[in-house]
Structure formats: structure tokens, C-alpha cells
Interface confidence: medium
């Protein structure tokens, strides 16, 4: 059990020509707010895919109204953390999506309107009980800041919240802050929130918010001394000399991201991720021009027109961001046909077709027809995951089995007589018609009103019917 | 499978109380809203109260504000309605619903039908002059 949170520490419009002045519409003021989505695993899942992990809202920021005079601002944010409680094992790789919604204040006939402004999607690997990671994303226009951590609750201890820690009640040597490393312990790294004041070196705690004095402590807050002291977890190496865990750095201490950037914990080490015009593993490298190559994934480099920005990066197709490092969420074009749902996998793009649907875009009707043969001569027509049969002449049903009486619709006008043949009907038509349906009179002259009839062919004689 | 079930509903005389309660079984609904609508005889279904898992956002009717209160118990999954000071004009059959914006929404409305996709089967209020 443990909880994810998220801080959101800026949200307003990223660097450059281009970015809004304001969250707002034209309809006048609004409020923003934010919702977080966990998923487990680093897949690309489909946006539609349930919050596995967990999601949560923060509370409304405050009314803004936009200055037309004044600099855009950072928005006011609301207030305080958006935390996700988990019950289960923490999985350690997750996907993080963070909505930025705003609330338009203008006049709504039934009730407010919310409107999507940004979206951000972070694959990351996140050990539980580890210090924040920082993060800046570009969701078009706008730039988010943000950190986040998972902690675990209650007794669960661990990178994945799954062991139970049973503090020890027996005093030891340890100094403040530090905690004994007995046997089958050493997964204890994070005690529960203990009540408030409760003392770091006496009191512990196995459930948040109260306070149990270690032998020869005593008080509400287990201040009043009265024998040796023990103490409790903090995470890190273990301390040869005293056999207790003493506090380790993690890789973002500090911040080793310079020139403003933000760092963000991965497995072993760190990632930094720079402001405009820094590059480099820690955002050392400044003053970047096209001959630094600061463009990513093929981006064509163009130099800038001004100081402030000294270079422009035209993204191939599935990037963006400043120097093209973002791939495009390519399943926003919609490139699935035929209601084919879209999963984009970072290499490709998949679509998973509907029923009767097949193609790299679901873009080909399946042929319905195979393996369902027409008789009869029959020819089958695809369509709509369904197969039909357009049936030969003297065949009907479903599939041109059942036999049809082709005279049965007295096709041979004017008094003709019809006799069924193999390969339909022919009219014996009565003096004075002709025609494979007796439908043209004879003149009296001995002249159709037709063109010559074909050769061996007399006016009164049986038309046969192709 | 999701379901929804209200209780609470009767009928009070104008100016009284009722607490109207909907219970969630088979769905979670952390970061997404459940709420009270309302339809009246021979008219559409209308919001009355929503509210978001933490408790954080509500939003009310312009018609109930000030005498309608809506919380939940998150560990009952559960949403109450407190109605004070009933008016015939809120007779009607009460229904609970539960949702919220998707992942793909680009515009969602918190007092109007279509943004909810769970619904309960409804209480009826009666309130006589």
C-alpha cells in the first residue's frame, strides 16, 4: 500500500513566438485544474485504456482573467498535492498522464464547461520511497513543471511497497536519525508519518499519526529521558561502525542539472532535462548554434533570427518539441479506419481493426466471400462483414441453391408464351410482337419498328433470351 | 458489473427534509464524479449536484444552490444528497449517476446527462404544497 503524488509547480505558455497569451477563451474568466492518470508498465497503451494505478483531481485554481496589457503569467495553480493511493504492490514502471483542464466561468446554459487545454504522457521508472523527480513537459503551447514520488504507507516498506515492517522496541546504539540493522530488517527503509513533534530518536510509530516510546522514554512525544535511545529508518548504505543505516544521496541531490534544468531519477543515475539553448548530460553546454547539431531524431536546424533564439529545429513527421525530442502522439490524426482502434508503440503505429476489417489501417473490407462459394454459378458480392450472392438467371436464395421458375413473373408480354431454359426464359411470342420479351409490335408491312431484326431471325419467331 | 442503487426517496411537505443516498458496487470512482439528476414528469433530465471522488469540486444546480448539499464516503462508496428546504417543483424521480471525462474528451459538462455513462435505476421524491 502506498500512495503516488504529484506536485504541480508551473503550468502556463512555453517559450517562443506563438504561445498563448491566456488559458481563457473569449467568453471571459476561467480556472484550472488538473487530473492525474496512472497506468502500469511502459507500453503505449490506447488512450481509451482504464487508470489502472489510480487517478485523482486537484481542487480548482483560482478565477483568472486575463490583463491585455500584461505579460502572460505562470496560472495560478490550486493548491496542495494530487496524491493516488494504491493498494497494491507499487510496479516501479508506469505511464503518467497529466491533464490540464479549465473551467470557462462565462455564462453556460446547464452548468459549466469544461475544456481539455494539455496533455502530457511520461513513461518512467519510479522506485517507491525515493526522493522527488523533477520534470518540465511541452504539451503544444504550454509548458508544464511538475514533480512526483511514490511512498509507501501503513508498515509496507520496500521499492514496491510489498514488505511489512515490524519496528524494532528494543533501544540500540544508533545516533539520531539513524536506525538498527538487525537481521531480516534491513527492507525497513520508510516508517509511517508518526504524530506530529514525536520524537526522531525515541518514539516510533506502526501507525500514522501516533506515538510509542522505545524503552526508557516516556511522554505524548517521548521526550522525558529515562534511558538509551534508539532510533528510526532512514533510507541508505549502512554505516559500517555502527551497524545502522545512515542517509544515502540519491542521484538528483543537489541537482546536478545546471543552467536551470530539471532532473529526473532513472535506474542508476539521472536524466536531465534542459531549458532552451543548454544541452548535455547535465545542461552544461550553452550558447548552442546549429553547428552543435541541438536538433534530434533527423530535425532540420535553422538558425534563428535573434539571440534568444539561436537556432530553430523543423521536426521530421512523429516529432516535436524544441529540438524535436518529443515524438507526436500520432494516434491524435486518427489514421485507423473503419473505427480501428489506435496504439501507438513508439517504433509503429498499430491498428487493431474491427471485425470484417484488416490492413495496416484497417482500411480493407475482409472478403467476405472467401470460403463461401455461390452455386449455380452464382457470384459473390463483400460488404459490411457480410457475404451475398448475386444469383445466375433460374437460381435464387442465399447462397443460389434454391431453383427459381424464371416464367413466374410472366416476363412475355403482349400474350407471349415463356418456356424456362438452362440459362433462363425464352418467349414464344403470339403473331404481331417480337423482342426477348415480345415487348415490340410488328407493323403490318412486314416491318419492325425496330432495325432490322438479326439475321435468321423472323418476325413471330421465339425470341431466346441471353 | 457496475451498479448504481439509490434510496432515501418519499414524499415531505414543503419545506422539509430528505437525504437521498446512492451506493457504487463494481466501480471505482477515483478522479471521476458521481451525481444526482433529476426528471420531472414530461421534461428532460436535469443536474442537480455532482461531486468528484476526493470531495474537492462540487458543483449545484442554480435551483438548488444554498438548499441542496451533495458529499460522499469514499470508504462506502457511496454519494448523499441532503435536500433542505423542499419545493413541489422538485418533485421528481431522482436518479444517481457515475463518470466523468475520458481520456479522449476534449469538452465535458459536470451537470449535463451525456458526461455520465453509469446510471441507477432512481428514488422518487414527492414534495406536496
Known amino acids: 500500500a502506498g500512495v503516488f503524488e504529484l506536485q504541480i509547480h508551473s503550468f502556463g505558455p512555453g517559450p517562443g513566438p506563438g504561445a498563448p497569451r491566456s488559458p481563457c477563451s473569449a467568453r471571459g474568466p476561467c480556472r484550472l485544474f488538473f487530473r492525474v492518470c496512472l497506468k502500469p508498465g511502459l507500453s503505449e497503451e490506447a488512450a481509451e485504456s482504464p487508470c489502472a494505478l489510480g487517478a485523482a483531481l486537484s481542487a480548482r485554481g483560482p478565477v483568472y482573467t486575463e490583463q491585455p496589457e500584461a505579460p502572460a503569467p505562470d496560472l495560478p495553480l490550486p493548491n496542495g498535492l494530487l496524491q493516488v493511493p494504491f493498494r497494491d504492490a507499487w510496479p516501479g514502471t508506469f505511464s503518467l498522464i497529466i491533464e490540464t483542464w479549465r473551467e470557462e466561468l462565462g455564462d453556460q446554459i446547464g452548468g459549466p464547461a469544461w475544456s481539455l487545454l494539455a496533455r502530457v504522457t511520461r513513461r518512467r521508472r519510479l522506485a517507491a520511497g525515493g526522493p522527488w523527480a523533477r520534470d518540465i513537459q511541452r504539451a503544444g503551447a504550454w509548458e508544464l513543471r511538475f514533480s512526483y514520488r511514490a511512498r509507501c504507507e501503513l508498515l509496507a516498506v520496500g521499492t514496491a511497497c510489498t514488505r511489512l515492517c515490524r519496528p524494532r522496541s528494543a533501544p540500540s546504539r544508533c545516533g539520531p536519525g539513524l536506525r538498527p540493522c538487525a537481521p531480516l530488517e534491513d527492507e525497513c527503509e520508510a516508517p509511517p508519518v508518526c504524530r506530529a513533534g514525536c520524537s526522531l530518536e525515541h518514539g516510533f510509530c506502526e501507525q500514522p499519526g501516533e506515538c510509542r516510546c522505545l524503552e526508557g522514554w516516556t511522554g505524548p512525544l517521548c521526550t522525558v529521558p529515562a534511558s538509551t535511545s534508539s532510533c528510526l529508518g532512514l533510507r541508505g548504505p549502512s554505516s559500517a561502525t555502527t551497524g545502522c543505516l545512515v542517509p544515502g544521496p540519491g542521484p538528483c541531490d543537489g541537482n546536478p542539472c545546471a543552467n536551470g534544468g530539471s532532473c529526473s531519477e532513472t535506474p542508476g543515475s539521472f536524466e536531465c532535462t534542459c531549458p532552451r539553448g543548454f544541452y548535455g548530460l547535465r545542461c552544461e553546454v550553452s550558447g548552442v548554434t546549429c553547428a552543435d547539431g541541438p536538433c534530434f531524431n533527423g530535425g532540420l536546424c535553422v538558425g534563428g533570427a535573434d539571440p534568444d533564439s539561436a537556432y530553430i529545429c523543423h521536426c521530421p513527421p512523429g516529432f516535436q518539441g524544441s529540438n524535436c525530442e518529443k515524438r507526436v502522439d500520432r494516434c491524435s490524426l486518427q489514421p485507423c479506419r473503419n473505427g480501428g482502434l489506435c496504439l501507438d508503440l513508439g517504433h509503429a503505429l498499430r491498428c487493431r481493426c474491427r471485425a470484417g476489417f484488416a490492413g495496416p489501417r484497417c482500411e480493407h473490407n475482409l472478403d467476405d466471400c472467401a470460403g463461401r462459394a455461390c452455386a449455380n454459378g452464382g457470384t459473390c458480392v463483400e460488404g459490411g462483414g457480410a457475404h451475398r450472392c448475386s444469383c445466375a438467371l433460374g437460381f435464387g436464395g442465399r447462397d443460389c441453391r434454391e431453383r427459381a421458375d424464371p416464367c413466374a413473373a410472366r416476363p412475355c408480354a403482349h400474350g407471349g408464351r415463356c418456356y424456362a431454359h438452362f440459362s433462363g426464359l425464352v418467349c414464344a411470342c403470339a403473331p404481331g410482337y417480337m423482342g426477348s420479351r415480345c415487348e415490340f409490335p410488328v407493323h403490318p408491312d412486314g416491318v419492325s419498328a425496330l432495325p432490322a431484326a438479326p439475321p435468321g431471325l423472323r418476325p413471330g419467331d421465339p425470341q431466346r433470351y441471353l | 458489473e457496475v451498479q448504481l442503487a439509490e434510496s432515501g426517496g418519499g414524499s415531505v411537505q414543503a419545506g422539509g427534509s430528505l437525504r437521498l443516498s446512492c451506493a457504487a458496487s463494481?466501480?471505482?470512482?477515483?478522479?471521476?464524479?458521481m451525481g444526482w439528476f433529476r426528471q420531472a414528469p414530461a421534461k428532460e433530465r436535469e443536474g442537480v449536484a455532482t461531486i468528484d471522488s476526493r470531495g474537492t469540486i462540487t458543483y449545484y444546480a442554480d435551483s438548488v444552490k444554498g438548499r441542496f448539499t451533495i458529499s460522499q464516503d469514499n470508504e462506502k462508496n457511496t454519494v448523499y444528497l441532503q435536500m433542505n428546504s423542499l419545493k413541489p417543483e422538485d418533485t421528481a424521480m431522482y436518479y444517481c449517476?457515475?463518470?466523468?471525462?475520458?481520456?479522449?474528451?476534449?469538452?465535458?459538462?459536470?451537470?449535463?446527462?451525456?458526461?455520465?455513462?453509469?446510471w441507477g435505476q432512481g428514488t422518487q421524491v414527492t414534495v406536496s404544497s
Open positions: 449517476a457515475a463518470g466523468g471525462p475520458r481520456t479522449n474528451d476534449d469538452r465535458w459538462y459536470p451537470l449535463r446527462p451525456p458526461g455520465y455513462n453509469y
Open positions: 463494481g466501480y471505482t470512482y477515483r478522479s471521476n464524479f
